[in-house]
Interface confidence: medium
């Protein structure tokens, strides 16, 4: 008789999840010499220990603490790039601008990027069939709690001028319900962070509107100002040219507005 299994609304654990995490860890520690001391088997054991045998709607930040410890890493606090709903461009940018970091450029973010995982209460099995959906099932699921934990701590680590890349093609350029809007904004530390600078990325070739005047950007400015952090905003009208000029800043066409 097949054992009854909880059916969740979200997709199941990513195929070959243990192998993927382990392989990513090994790759990351090879590329980043300052992390070569990391024992990837211990990292996997800590990752697994955060959610295996636990009810996937009852995960806490504390469950991830052993993993957090193993992922301890120096991040230049004045070189942090946050993003919301525009991950690919943010990552392309930090691949070119090597001294800036998104969360996914850190070991912990790199390990989990684009992956899904969950277990089952009281069994050592990984659930490859389905995992809880944040909206339809529960918010305290393994993936959501992981990202909330690392995002909060990443924002807490930021200092001086913090940059955030926002998607100007979306109806809500700043979304209070995104990880940036609900976690990172509220965990920037006013004692350390002087300015939050938003880069609003335009989608359309002919779009010359000033999206920094968008009501949701004004809402972000209000939230940030109330936290005693200065706010500034820039339109990035041509993201392709923007990236090109980051690669080749001496190019004569890069003196004009991007």
């Amino acid at each position: 008789v097949p054992r009854w299994r909880q059916q969740w609304s979200g997709p199941g654990t990513t195929k070959r999840f243990p192998e993927t995490v382990l392989a990513r860890c090994v790759k990351y520690t090879e590329i980043h010499p300052e992390m070569r001391h990391v024992d990837c088997q211990s990292v996997w054991d800590a990752f697994k220990g955060a959610f295996i045998s636990k009810h996937p709607c009852n995960i806490t930040e504390e469950d991830y603490q052993p993993l957090m410890k193993l992922g301890t890493q120096t991040v230049p606090c004045n070189k942090i790039l946050l993003w919301s709903r525009i991950k690919d461009l943010a990552h392309q940018f930090t691949q070119v601008q090597r001294d800036m970091f998104t969360l996914e450029d850190t070991l912990l973010g790199y390990l989990a990027d684009d992956l899904t995982w969950c277990g089952e209460f009281n069994t050592s099995k990984i659930n490859y069939q389905s995992c809880p959906d944040w909206r339809k099932d529960c918010s305290n699921n393994p993936v959501s709690v992981f990202w909330k934990t690392v995002s909060r701590r990443f924002a807490e680590a930021a200092c001086d001028v913090v940059h955030v890349m926002l998607n100007g093609s979306r109806s809500k350029i700043f979304d209070k319900n995104s990880t940036f809007g609900s976690v990172e904004v509220h965990n920037l530390q006013p004692e350390k962070v002087q300015t939050l600078e938003a880069w609003v990325i335009h989608g359309g070739r002919e779009d010359s509107r000033d999206l920094c005047q968008d009501p949701t950007i004004k809402e972000l400015e209000s939230i940030i100002s109330k936290r005693n952090i200065q706010f500034s905003c820039k339109n990035i009208y041509r993201p392709d040219k923007f990236l090109q000029c980051v690669k080749n800043p001496e190019d004569s066409s890069c003196t004009s507005e991007i």
């Epitope: 957090m68 992922g71 301890t72 004692e191």
Partner: nanobody
Framework: EVQVLESGGGLVQPGGSLRLSCAAS????????MHWVRQAPGKEREWVAV????????YYADSVKGRFTISRDNSKNTLYLQLNSLKSEDTAVYYC????????????RGQGTLVTVSS
Amino acid sequence: EVQVLESGGGLVQPGGSLRLSCAASGFTFSSYGMHWVRQAPGKEREWVAVISYDGNTIYYADSVKGRFTISRDNSKNTLYLQLNSLKSEDTAVYYCALGAGSGPFFDNRGQGTLVTVSS
């Protein structure tokens, strides 16, 4: 502006002890986790220990566990690292660093203090 100033380094024989201090200013010291990290000549920076804002959560790197003790005095805005049973491989510049809670991300903000273990 966030500032940390490390002191207490020096030359010590193997098996000896030292106490490092880190004076912090420009932020509410009692609200932040603090780290010690070190960098040996020609090597990458290595994390040593972390203490949470209230002193209740402490972690050490395996290489120093049982020999080093991290502590803090929030009334003096000062972080400490007691180094016992020192070995030659502990020779490094020691930095105190402002953390986020109890990690995992931190930033080196000080000039460091040099610890040399040699006979």
